[in-house]
Structures are given as C-alpha cells and as structure tokens.
Amino acid sequence: VKTRRDASGDLLNTEAHSAPAQRWSMQVPAEVNAEAGDAAVLPCTFTHPHRHYDGPLTAIWRSGEPYAGPQVFRCTAAPGSELCQTALSLHGRFRLLGNPRRNDLSLRVERLALADSGRYFCRVEFTGDAHDRYESRHGVRLRVTAAPRIVNISVLPGPAHAFRALCTAEGEPPPALAWSGPAPGNSSAALQGQGHGYQVTAELPALTRDGRYTCTAANSLGRAEASVYLFRFHGAPG
C-alpha cells in the first residue's frame, strides 16, 4: 500500500496494485452570473479513481475560501443509495441538483441576494472503505447583479443651521447617483462616495431652497428614484 496526500492535505491510502483510469479532478466554471431575486446554478462535476464506488458519501459546498470557509450545504448518501439526504441548507436556499453517485454536485441557489456574491467550493467525501475526499481549489465565483434600489434617503441638519441630504442606493454594478432639486445646478454639488460592497452613498451638502429633492440611481440594469421634501418654518417679522 502506498500513500498520497489529497487536496485537503490528508494522508490517504491507495492500493499499490490498482491502476485507476481516472484521477481526482473537479470541473467548475470560473464564474456564474445571476440576478438578485432569481436562482442560480453552480455547476460542479468530478472524476475519482475509485471505480464503481457505492459506499457512503458526503457532498459539501462552502463559501468564501476552500477547506475552511463556512458550509452552506451538506448532504449524505447511504451505501447504495441514489438519494443524498440534505443535512444543511443555509437559510433553506441551497438545493442539490446533481446526483453525487453520477459524479455531479451541482447546486441550485434560490432567492439570490447581492450578499450571496462570492466564491463557492464543492467537496465530496467518500467515507466508506475507500476513504478519500476532494475539494475544488479555485471554486466558482457567483456574481449577483441587481438593478438599483434606493435603501435610504434622508435630510439631516448640517453646519450653520443649514441642511444636507443623504441618499444610499444598492445595486450591481454599483449605481451612479445624482441629485436634483429646486436650486439651479445643485445636482453638481452631490458628493458621491463608495459605500460598503454594493452600496453607494451620495450627499447633497447644502440645501439652499425649500422644495423637493430627488435622488436618482442608475446602472446598466435599470434606474430608481426617491424624493425628500424640505420645508423650513420662517418666523414672522418682529
């Protein structure tokens, strides 16, 4: 018997006299694109050196990083069973499409959110006599796109009894924000800063007139707008 290391660094036994036609490999696309609110499929197929393996197995998907990232999905199949019984599905949104017995670990992700963007890694573990495991090193990058959505718009007190307006929008690609209002040319005064991740915030630093101020967010998938109103009480002359 000789030993070798698998992709996760574990020492594994392989029969010295076996000459497997296949070696361990995993096939995943570099990137998958999908829209927020929709579903995505993360394809993953594999080959392995254990001819006609029919023992117990576990299929795992994790996010973030290989080997150590948090699991988002896990299922186990009993010896001889075609059914992989789901043991973990984060937020109930991950469903195994593929049949691990047929070397397919493809996963469906439902009700996508922008926060689902990132890398996902598939892993299979043979837990019977042929104790072996393999995990994709590079994984598949899920890129969730979304039309703009304005998540917050507000008027806040500013310096010297003035007021300022803030608009925060999210989307992927990150949307461009623009302000318009009753004062001529005030949209050019918007200060745009990148928020965290897929959120963008734009500030209108000085609201000089009463009236309606509108924030517009736009990206290649669409546009959204929201308005706030400024009405100041002007005291009667003494």
Epitope: V32, V41, P43, L88, S89, G92, L97, R108
Partner: antibody, heavy 121, light 111 residues
C-alpha cells in the same frame, strides 16, 4: 413500494371548506417535498401548492390565484400531507393529486390516484 | 408566470413510427446548462407518470424509446417507436420559476 393515497374529496357548496389528506408509505417522508396538483374535468394539470421538509424550514409555496384560500401542511409523524381549502368556488372543481418531489428538483416523481372535489350548489 | 405551449395539440402516429411533441417556454428555463423542463404521461383514468426530468434524463422504469432534448425555450419529447400502450396525453412542466406550470397537453393516438 412507494404509496400515495389521497382522501377527503367530495361535494361541497360554494363558499364551503374541505380538508384533503394524503397518506404516504414506502419512503422516508422527511426527506421529500410534498405537493398538490389539480386537474379540472377534461382539462390540463395545474400545480396548487408545495410544502418543503424540516431542513428547508417547512417552507410553503402556492399558486398565486389560490394563496389565502388554500393552506398546505404536513404531519411527519403520520407521513401525511394536508390541503385545507376554504371559500371554495365552482372553478376549484377538480381531481386533486398528491405528489412527491425530491429536495433537489421540483418535478413530481410519484403521484396518488387523486381525489375528486366538486364545488356545486 | 412562465407559459408553456405544446404542439401539436393532438398527434396520430402509426405503430412503430416516431412521435415528436414540442414544448415552448415563454422565457428561458435553462440555467448554466441545466434545463428545468420535465415530461409526464397520463393515460385515461390514471394519474400522470414522470417520464423525463430536466429535459433529457429518463425517469426510473421508463422504456428507452422515450427521450427528451432541448435547451433554452424549445424542448422535444420523442417516442422513437410508438407502442399501443403509449396512447396517452403528454404534458411538459417547468420548474425554473415558481409557480411551476404545465403545458396544455398533447394527445397521442394510433393512426
């Protein structure tokens, strides 16, 4: 052998209520999603509702036109799924089939024989 | 909702001949190479029976003369050599997006 047996159908007046039951055996009920699909006399198939299993938080899904009137539920200890139908209308007259689906696919791999619901005055 | 339109509505085929049924979706039902279209057979007085899942996978116990193909919006169910017991109505169904919807059905008869 997988068995799916519906019961509870019958004649009901418009505005009335009915509760359908679907008793299953021959498989591990907890591992599967369960559904109701209906077929009006001489017409095609219409998906009605789905209930997922514990891992999937027993999430329920409905055909939009039925939501609010119909409620799907399951009793894992009895391997049984139910469909509570309220405010019934003449257009709800159909054979109601109980179906099983795998957690990974919303297709229906086993069907019961169906139970006929007739809504008429 | 995704609308599935089957064609033809009915089909008469000689015994031993090929029968082809089409199913067109109002939008793509394929994601990353997976097509969420399934086919059922319903004989008179019986519940439907799963024939094909995800466009081309033969369900357990279904004869190999049944096959499915297609991607995107256009799908086909083929019976390579029609047998007397294949007389039935055939339905396609999509599970790309909820609510799951069915085609209107295609009735297959012997010519």
């Amino acid at each position: 052998e997988v068995q799916v047996v519906e019961s509870g159908g019958g004649l009901v007046q418009p505005g009335g209520s009915l509760r359908l039951s679907c008793a299953t055996s021959g498989f591990n009920f907890n591992d599967y999603f369960m559904n109701w699909v209906r077929q009006a006399p001489g017409k095609g198939l219409e998906w009605v509702a789905q209930i997922r299993n514990k891992i999937y938080t027993y999430a329920t899904f409905y055909a939009e036109s039925l939501e609010g009137r119909f409620t799907i539920s399951r009793d894992n200890s009895k391997s049984t799924v139910y469909l509570q139908m309220n405010s019934l209308r003449a257009e709800d007259t159909a054979v109601y089939y109980c179906t099983r689906s795998l957690t990974g696919g919303d297709y229906f791999d086993y069907w019961g024989q169906g139970t006929l619901v007739t809504v008429s005055s | 909702d995704i609308v599935l339109t089957q064609s033809p509505d009915s089909l008469a085929v000689s015994l031993g001949e090929r029968a082809t049924i089409n199913c067109r979706a109002s939008q793509s039902v394929t994601i990353s190479g997976y097509s969420f279209i399934h086919w059922y057979q319903q004989k008179p007085g019986q519940p439907p029976k799963l024939l094909i899942y995800r466009a081309s996978n033969l369900a357990s116990g279904i004869p190999a003369r049944f096959s499915g193909s297609g991607s995107g919006t256009d799908f086909t169910l083929t019976i390579s050599s029609l047998q007397a017991e294949d007389v039935a109505t055939y339905y396609c169904q999509q599970s790309r997006k909820s609510p799951w919807t069915f085609g209107q059905g295609t009735k297959v008869e012997i010519k």
